[in-house]
């Protein structure tokens, strides 16, 4: 049993790291393969992390970490039984994945102007909760062509667009991510998607 | 938020014996040592000894060893530490802490007073 | 054993003025990992100690920036670059490395 690639990390910079790997041949990760990973400078023994599978040859492991900081680095051992397969670390600070925002909502009520809102994904005791900006993506259900990104760059969890910026009459979706500069991350998955039907009135031409 | 709550004042004969609740909530119970620590008054911090809630495995310091019993219940997330034979310099107050960066998490400590 | 060795055991201070405070071990706190395990508390009047350096030089968490670590092997050092008021009561240097022992603490009071 060997290790064809090698297990690389993520952290959502709050409670939860994901690493993935690949084994040279199928493998039962959970009943053959234990991750093991410890602060460290935490002179104790390791925590235990049971990886599921991911593809026939792939695994995946959720390490639970009750918090994180920038100083912050882990030892990461790849056990079968008694025989070590791989020993690495993991600074989760240079490896952020952040959390998804949530309640994405599409407000349309307000004058032909539509206001989305969504959460952040961090409380506010996380240092990622004043560094998040956003990249909001809207598209239309009927025309693959009609697709288009608004960065946020400021912290507010909003965005205000003009209704006329879009075809009225026909339903839109609209979805959001996140990235943090601070850390350099990767993006986070796209949140849900939310949809709504898009209309307003056509201003009055004169002649 | 990490959160170490212990249990109240004792009032122990000497010769008798104390035991001292400290139940955590917050974190991993079993993914960090507790160290218990003792402060006489108006003195220093004198560590006693750790135990591990995930395995119970114990390290008592010198001091304080054939005296000492510390021991968790997972279930409740609570570790406990007993002093026996009490004597009037056991008098301090008793501090469990968790340690991760450092000691990073402390109870709010239990006075032990030691009086015929 | 190691031997922590606080020094001075009392510190007036001026708030807005700077303050330090050393700590000397009998043996090296450099572990073979390249972190020095030297801790610092401060415990104010009827409170549970509080951590505010781990590791030499990391801040913990929500502890301000006016603090912080410095030295390497036996000697540290704590600096508070601005004392305020809140900054009083006793700090304690302690060593991680082998099994706790704790400095004898200095007391900082406002002059």
């Known amino acids: 049993m060997k290790v064809l690639q090698e297990p690389t990390c993520v952290s959502d910079y709050m409670s939860i790291s994901t690493c993935e790997w690949k084994m040279n041949g199928p493998t039962n990760c959970s009943t053959e393969l234990r991750l093991l990973y410890q602060l460290v400078f935490l002179l104790s023994e390791a925590h235990t992390c049971i990886p599921e599978n991911n593809g026939g040859a792939g695994c995946v492991c959720h390490l639970l970490m009750d918090d994180v900081v920038s100083a912050d680095n882990y030892t990461l051992d790849l056990w079968a039984g008694q025989q070590l397969l791989w020993k690495g670390s993991f600074k989760p600070s240079e490896h952020v994945k952040p959390r998804a925002p949530g309640n994405l909502t599409v407000h349309t009520n307000v004058s032909d102007t539509l206001l989305l809102t969504w959460s952040n994904p961090y409380p506010p005791d996380n240092y990622l909760y004043n560094h998040l900006t956003y990249a909001v993506n809207i598209w239309s259900e009927n025309d693959p062509a009609d697709f288009r990104i608004y960065n946020v760059t400021y912290l507010e969890p909003s965005l205000r667009i003009a209704a006329s910026t879009l075809k009225s009459g026909i339903s839109y979706r609209a979805r959001v991510r996140a990235w943090a500069q601070c850390y350099n991350t990767t993006w986070s998955e796209w949140s849900p998607s939310t949809k709504w039907h898009n209309s307003y009135r056509e201003p009055f031409e004169q002649h | 938020q990490v959160q170490l709550v212990q249990s109240g004042a004792e009032v122990k004969k000497p010769g008798a014996s104390v035991k001292v609740s400290c139940k955590a909530s917050g974190y991993t119970f079993t993914g960090y040592y507790i160290y218990w620590v003792r402060q006489a008054p108006g003195q220093g911090l004198e560590w006693m000894g750790w135990?591990?809630?995930?395995?119970?495995?114990?390290n008592y310091a010198q001091k304080f060893q054939g005296r000492v019993t510390m021991t968790r219940d997972t279930s409740i997330s609570t570790v406990y530490m007993e002093l026996s034979r009490l004597r009037s310099d056991d008098a301090a107050v008793y501090y469990c802490a968790k340690r991760k960066r450092g000691l990073d998490g402390w109870g709010q400590g239990t006075t032990v007073t030691v009086s015929s | 054993d190691i031997m922590m060795t606080q020094s001075p055991l009392s510190l007036p201070v001026t708030p807005g003025e700077p303050a330090s405070i050393s700590c000397r071990s009998s043996?090296?706190?450099?572990?073979?990992?390249?972190?020095?395990?030297l801790d610092w508390y401060l415990q104010k009047p009827g409170q549970s100690p509080q951590l505010l350096i781990y590791?030499?030089?990391n801040r913990a968490s929500g502890v301000p920036d006016r603090f912080s670590g410095s030295g390497s092997g036996t000697d540290f050092t704590l600096k508070i670059s601005r004392v305020e008021a809140e900054d009083v009561g006793v700090y304690y240097c302690?060593?991680?490395?082998?099994?706790?022992?704790f400095g004898g603490g200095t007391k900082v009071e406002i002059k």
């Open positions: 135990i591990n809630p995930n395995s119970g495995g114990t």
């Open positions: 302690m060593q991680g490395l082998q099994t706790l022992t």
């Open positions: 590791l030499g030089s």
């Open positions: 043996q090296s706190l450099l572990h073979s990992n390249g972190y020095n395990y």
